[in-house]
Amino acid sequence: QSNNSLMLQTSKENHTLASNSLCMDEKQITQNHSKVLAEVNISWPVQMARNAVLCCPPIEFRNLIVITWEIILRGQPSCTKSYRKETNETKETNCTDERITWVSTPDQNSDLQIHPVAITHDGYYRCIMATPDGNFHRGYHLQVLVTPEVTLFESRNRTAVCKAVAGKPAAQISWIPAGDCAPTEQEYWGNGTVTVKSTCHWEGHNVSTVTCHVSHLTGNKSLYIELLPVPGAKKSAK
């Protein structure tokens, strides 16, 4: 292992949201038998470029009159996709994004798919199932996640810079061992992503290797670098 080398310590991106091609797990809810039917709202982080499937409430087709998906995306008019069972008619209003579609024909499957998920798909999605006795709702606050690109380099004598570039939401950076760190800098991009930069200095020569740990909803990443022992020498590693 050469001096001043940058090593990927863990790229174990622990995807708790490993596959978004299945519907979100059902939440614990208790339905009562009144006409006021429960509305379930779920916050759901989804990784960009994956396939996401959003589900309606568990109402069988035989009990339905109309299935409606309402899609509210930032800065766009509300899009509505609906299917009326009696007439076998599908209708769309203000829906322009071709990546958001029914999984199948609505009479076969009422689920909605986003393929692939883009950063612009942040928003609120609601399935409304109309039955003869009232409506059932299931809503999703979809938060699109973007994995940041992590870089680590020694900028000058025993000072390291760790960057988590263009992540969504902002990543968190920590160091092992702790150094003398400048306040973390954040740069916001127009598309909703954030670059986080942390700069730290280690005065004592007893510290030879430092690790930058980046925590993010899409998974954690740690990089380490060997600090140059000789003052004045400047080298970066990839």
Epitope: D25, E26, H33, P58, N63, P132, D133
Partner: antibody, heavy 119, light 111 residues
Framework: EVQLQQSGPELVKPGASVKMSCKAS????????MHWVKQKPGQGLEWIGY????????KHNEKFKDKATLTSAKSSSTVYMELSSLTSEDSAVYYC????????????WGQGTLVTVSA | DIVLTQSPASLAVSLGQRATISCRAS??????????LHWYQQKPGQPPKLLIY???NLESGVPARFSGSGSGTDFTLNIHPVEEEDAATYYC?????????FGGGTKLEIK
């Protein structure tokens, strides 16, 4: 209050037919699917089929396709099941049960109709 | 058709203890993010009574000592603490597609 009232016990001869009823009250009859379930003495439950009174949509368990005929009468809020060509294997308690929208569960059941097939 | 296998066929549990009943499906009962697996209690001479729906949701009016868990193909009904009135036969049911099917039943006896 939702109630499903089933007709009384029947003693019938082999080869004959029997028609039992399930009268619904306490809700809009045509809004909910009604299912029928069989339970032989000391045994488990077996799904027979359903009828949707709204449009008379009917689905059967293949096993009961030629055995059970399901009908409904909107005017009296009643569903019926007729069993034909009876044998001792048809001796059982028959339940009607209303399907709830959410999860297709059976939250309301009739008290059951006992059918005894005997010579 | 999905086959539901319940175990044990019968069990005896002391008052106040935990009763655990298992239901295994021949294939996954999960459809569109939901497990269409319900639990019923039946006492002699009575119709079944719904306890748990969609694997883990307690039906209105059912005591909180009843709970359901599981996903995919393996499901469990737990009763804790068991009371005298819980002596009954318990059935799991699948309702995700036709035909609906029931497990063979588990008879619970209170010691």
């Amino acid at each position: 209050e939702v109630q499903l009232q089933q007709s009384g016990p029947e003693l019938v001869k082999p080869g004959a037919s029997v028609k039992m009823s399930c009268k619904a009250s306490g809700y809009t009859f045509t809004s909910y699917v009604m299912h029928w379930v069989k339970q032989k003495p000391g045994q488990g439950l077996e799904w027979i089929g359903y009828i949707h009174p709204y449009n008379d949509d009917i689905k059967h368990n293949e096993k009961f396709k030629d055995k059970a005929t399901l009908t409904s009468a909107k005017s009296s809020s009643t569903v019926y099941m007729e069993l034909s060509s009876l044998t001792s294997e048809d001796s059982a308690v028959y339940y009607c049960a209303r399907e709830e929208y959410y999860g297709s569960r059976f939250a309301y059941w009739g008290q059951g109709t006992l059918v005894t097939v005997s010579a | 058709d999905i086959v539901l296998t319940q175990s044990p066929a019968s069990l005896a549990v002391s008052l106040g203890q935990r009763a655990t009943i298992s239901c295994r499906a021949s294939k996954s009962v999960r459809t569109s993010g939901y497990s269409y697996l319900h639990w019923y209690q039946q006492k002699p001479g009575q119709p079944p009574k719904l306890l748990i729906y969609l694997a883990s949701n307690l039906e209105s009016g059912v005591p909180a000592r009843f709970s359901g868990s599981g996903s995919g193909t393996d499901f469990t009904l737990n009763i804790h603490p068991v009371e005298e009135e819980d002596a009954a036969t318990y059935y799991c049911q699948y309702s995700g597609e036709l035909p609906f099917t029931f497990g063979g039943g588990t008879k619970l006896e209170i010691k």
